[in-house]
């Protein structure tokens, strides 16, 4: 699987999950998030050669098409597969609120 | 929606579904598919600016991150959202077989 266990331990050029730390205030301008200051959102990148973690029949077909027609602009793209939530603390006036934001952390990638 | 109804009628630079005809024999080397000869598989391409048909909270966050950090390599990617099946005819020896291949035709795209 193209997950953090594999991708963070290997120098993988093809589609894989990459570490990306986002600081809410500095990188997003989100001053309202009090905790955490930031988090590892991670991201997916790298080429998607034929059959590499193909998401659907279409991505398999497109991968093969791209292999046999290298000049073509159409090819699968490396995108998130498994995502995990992130719990944040913020304030509404003087009242603290805790919320779980879904699909915030990329744990693995796929070619789609 | 970034679907064929919209994308095929507009000159859209950003993420959209694009027409792509694939000939089974010529483009994939699949001699075993007898009908159809080929089909419009289509594909997704184009930049994913902030909030454009964002698939998850992560893609929204990544889009904003990319807007505020233009030099960053991390950005959402334009990939298939809705896919449709394709019915094909092939022969096993002298016996005709009809099969519905799932997720073969891209009907719309999203930023993921």
């Amino acid at each position: 699987a193209l997950d953090t266990n594999y991708c963070f331990r290997n120098l993988e050029e093809n589609c894989c999950v990459r570490p990306l730390y986002i600081d809410f205030r500095q990188d997003l301008g989100w001053k309202w998030v009090h905790e955490p200051k930031g988090y590892y959102a991670n991201f997916c990148s790298g080429p998607c050669p034929y059959l590499r973690s193909a998401d659907t029949t279409h991505s398999t077909v497109l991968g093969l098409y791209n292999t046999l027609n290298p000049e073509a602009s159409a090819s699968p793209c490396c995108v998130p597969q498994d995502l995990e939530p992130l719990t944040i603390l913020y304030y509404v006036g003087r009242t603290p609120k805790v919320e779980q934001l879904s699909n915030m952390v990329v744990k693995s990638c796929k070619c789609s | 929606a970034l679907d064929t109804n919209y994308c095929f009628r507009n000159l859209e630079e950003n993420c959209c579904v694009r027409p792509l005809y694939i000939d089974f024999r010529q483009d994939l080397g699949w001699k075993w598919v007898h009908e159809p000869k080929g089909y419009y598989a289509n594909f997704c391409s184009g930049p994913c600016p902030y909030l454009r048909s964002a698939d998850t909270t992560h893609s929204t966050v990544l889009g904003l991150y990319n807007t505020l950090n233009p030099e960053a390599s991390a950005s959402p990617c334009c990939v298939p959202q809705d896919l449709e099946p394709l019915t094909i005819l092939y022969y096993v020896g002298r016996t005709p077989k009809v099969e519905q291949l799932s997720n073969m035709v891209v009907k719309s795209c999203k930023c993921s």
Partner: antibody, heavy 119, light 111 residues
């Protein structure tokens, strides 16, 4: 260009044998099913024998009229189709065509070879 | 085995005529939306030639005056404007199941 060249036809006495050959070129012979179709004088086309590719275990078919007398075979290394005809009868007199059916239709045909069974 | 019955068995026509040949199968030769019937032209001393495959698809190099239609058990070959070179015998053939069989043929003669 697809070419199918039959040979081996001729005059033979009833009860005799003949071996027809069909040399194929211009296509991937290994991948496709091959057949022998005949036309007897004043009659229509009849599928006599058929053999599919190695992928499908060289499965064969014979019409009832030739079963146990004719044997179809192929040599993929030589791109050649064969029809071994034994115990020939007068009613086997016909033009025999070699043909290739990539799918459900016989797309290409040889020029035919005449087999005459007569005493 | 699936039997194919062609009609008429022979016909006389003139150059420029519209000619229709039918082929009826003893059971359906269609599967899903695919119609597994094919048509051939056969001239004396020549090898048969594929005209139409899967009911309505024109084979490579065949003039557009030839067309095919039908589904299930009933199929038609049409020559929109008969030409001198079209006088021949025409056969239908199915590939719905093994064994594939041919129709008895329709001989198109000059009137």
């Amino acid at each position: 260009e697809v070419q199918l060249l039959e040979s081996g036809g001729g005059l033979v006495q009833p009860g005799g044998s003949l071996r027809l050959s069909c040399a194929a070129s211009g296509f991937d012979f290994n991948s496709y099913g091959m057949s022998w179709v005949r036309q007897a004088p004043g009659k229509g086309l009849e599928l006599v024998a058929d053999i599919v590719s190695k992928t499908y275990n060289y499965t064969t078919y014979y019409s009832d009229s030739v079963k146990d007398r004719f044997t179809i075979s192929r040599d993929d290394s030589k791109s050649t189709l064969y029809l071994q005809m034994n115990s020939l009868r007068a009613e086997d007199t016909a033009v025999y065509y070699c043909t290739v059916a990539p799918g459900g239709s016989f797309d290409y045909w040889g020029q035919g070879t005449l087999v005459t069974v007569s005493s | 085995d699936i039997q194919l019955t062609q009609s008429p068995s022979s016909l006389s026509a003139s150059v420029g005529d519209r000619v229709t040949i039918t082929c009826r199968a003893s059971q359906s030769v269609s599967i899903s939306r695919f119609n597994l019937m094919h048509w051939y032209q056969h001239k004396p001393g020549k090898q048969p030639k594929l005209l139409i495959y899967r009911a309505s698809n024109l084979a490579s190099g065949i003039p557009s005056r030839f067309s095919g239609s039908g589904s299930g058990t009933d199929f038609t070959l049409t020559i929109s404007s008969l030409q001198p070179e079209d006088f021949a015998t025409y056969y239908c053939q199915h590939s719905r199941e093994s064994p594939w069989t041919f129709g008895g043929g329709t001989k198109v003669e000059i009137k």
